[in-house]
């Protein structure tokens, strides 16, 4: 059929909860392409009816929820004007209850379910929740050894759990939990994460570089909505936290009640030698009190700020 076959690594997944996989393969999917999902070399495409338990949602295949019998090889066919690629994804579903004491029953989990914290440093764990826009995710709760995590050393920030002054006791089995809503139905997502510790600096103590902002002011009208990206390059092994602060406080905490100013979800693009991270700050409505205040983007030891200022009056 003239399609080039591409084989992705195996995905090992937990039964009885939602799962989604996005058929993206840059640069193939960057242009005008059509994407169709199939299961086990079937000629019949996966349903696009949103009421179906398994259906295609734009470029995604979505399982609501995943079940034991869903294991198998799924193919997504990406057709461009002059090209065709068939991406094979091997999904293995296992039955795992994260509070089981018998951790020996765990399969060889994929890398995002194995994370490393750096001793003595401020570090973070990430709850990997990859779902299409049609899925709305609620706030994330974090657990260690089946107990909800509380304490001043721990801060939940979007999809991350920030851990300050990591100690040896922080190693072990974690889980992050969120409620996913799709077409009015709610599902629980629970990701188990095995967390190990290391003393190694890993990235050789390199300093992240903030590409933008550059310690400058931005003219913005009172009452408008403003989104500013903080773009950071850093080494692949970095353990640096990236966040927005005002008055030395995380913006999400500082504006906890009004939620008028919020930090966005961090994204990154991976290059051969480094990662480019983006985390934005959103002002839903700029108020007078925001002017002249430095909003700081932090990335490890690096900082850069923006200051909002009123546009100069136009006397014409």
């Amino acid at each position: 059929d003239g399609c080039k076959d591409i084989f992705m690594k195996n995905e090992i997944l937990s039964a009885s909860q939602p799962f989604a996989f996005n058929c993206t393969f840059p640069p193939i999917t960057s242009g005008e392409v059509s994407v169709t999902w199939y299961k086990n070399s079937s000629k019949i495409p996966v349903s696009k009816i949103i009421q179906s338990r398994i259906h295609q949602d734009e470029t995604w295949i979505l399982f609501l929820p995943m079940e034991w019998g869903d294991s198998g090889v799924y193919q997504c066919v990406i057709k461009g004007r002059d090209s065709c690629h068939r991406i094979h994804v091997n999904l293995t579903v296992f039955e795992k209850h994260w509070c089981d004491t018998s951790i020996g029953g765990l399969p060889n989990l994929s890398d995002e379910y194995k994370q490393i914290l750096h001793l003595g440093k401020d570090d973070s764990l990430t709850c990997h929740l990859h779902f299409p826009k049609s899925c709305v995710l609620g706030p994330i709760k974090w657990y260690k050894d089946c107990n909800e995590i509380k304490g001043e050393r721990f801060t939940v920030l979007e999809t991350r759990l920030l851990v300050s002054n990591v100690s040896a006791e922080d190693r072990g089995n974690y889980a992050c939990q969120a409620i996913l809503t799709h077409s009015g139905k709610q599902y629980e997502v629970l990701n188990g994460i095995t967390v190990s510790i290391t003393e190694r600096a890993g990235y050789g103590g390199s300093v992240p570089k903030i590409i933008y902002p550059k310690n400058h002011s931005i003219e913005v009208q009172l009452g408008t909505t403003l989104i500013v990206d903080c773009n950071v390059t850093d080494t692949k092994d970095n353990t640096n936290l990236r966040c927005w602060r005002v008055n030395n406080t995380l913006v999400d905490d500082y504006y906890d009640e009004s939620k008028r100013i919020r930090e966005g979800v961090e994204t990154h693009v991976s290059f051969r030698e480094h990662n480019l991270y983006t985390v934005n700050i959103t002002f839903l409505e700029v108020k007078m009190e925001d002017y002249g205040l430095p909003f700081m983007c932090h990335a490890g030891v690096s900082t850069a700020y923006i200051i909002l200022q009123l546009p100069a009056p136009d006397f014409r």
């Epitope: 001793l119 072990g172 190694r200």
Partner: antibody
């Protein structure tokens, strides 16, 4: 069960490059840290370096100008190259990894070691 | 570089003896790791995070210390304990081993 196995020539000529392979089973080299250590005859252990889960490499500064650690994730193997070898590089070379009790630095899993002799 | 100095370098002792091996670091280290090695074999992780015994290590072994001074103690020496013991630190690169302590039968 994690297993590591070193392989490569047991004899290397002076000034040439020593090349070793560590084949890993029971774990993915895209998680954790994958180390090389050597043991000089009648002497102690020397830490050579590691390649991490993301492909980042760290080398002992005493060997940095001569050592390269790389990997092939599709084969689940990682490699050691040591250039311009001399008799002082004669040693048993080990690959090892940690992760025991969730401690990456606790080097619990070791290969059996391979003796490399540098001689003309 | 952090220098790791083990003392003694070699030690002759008898079965049933209490034995202490010391590892001194030239700068503070957060944790110490100890390995046992027998001739012709790969090293084995023996003690990690200063005081935790690896799987299969008898309870007669213990580890302690902080800062620059760490010890491995055997409360009652057994025939299978005769080997070389190495300390190692991962706090500061380069990650260094001690020169080893060879424990021999008297």
């Amino acid at each position: 069960q994690v297993q590591l196995q070193e392989s490569g020539p047991g004899l290397v000529k002076p000034s040439q490059t020593l090349s070793l392979t560590c084949t890993v089973s029971g774990a993915s080299i895209t998680s954790g840290y994958w180390n090389w250590i050597r043991n000089h005859p009648g002497k102690g252990l020397e830490y050579i370096g590691y390649i991490s889960y993301s492909g980042y490499t760290y080398y002992n500064p005493s060997l940095k100008s001569r050592v390269t650690i790389s990997r092939d994730t599709s084969k689940n193997q990682y490699y050691l190259k040591l250039s311009s070898v001399t008799a002082a590089d004669t040693a048993v070379y080990y690959c090892a990894t940690g992760g025991y009790d969730y401690v990456e630095d606790a080097l619990y899993y070791w290969g059996q070691g391979t003796l490399v002799t540098v001689s003309s | 570089d952090i220098q790791m100095t083990q003392s003694p370098s070699s030690l002759s002792a008898s079965v049933g003896d209490r034995v202490t091996i010391t590892c001194r670091a030239s700068s503070n280290v957060r944790y110490m790791y100890w390995y046992q090695q027998k001739p012709g074999k790969a090293p084995k992780l023996w003690i990690y995070l200063t005081s935790n015994l690896a799987s299969g290590v008898p309870s007669r072994f213990s580890g302690s210390g902080s800062g620059t001074s760490y010890t491995l103690t055997i409360s009652s020496l057994q025939p299978e304990d005769f080997a070389t013991y190495y300390c190692q630190q991962f706090t500061t690169s380069p990650y260094t081993f001690g020169q080893g302590t060879k424990l021999e039968i008297k």
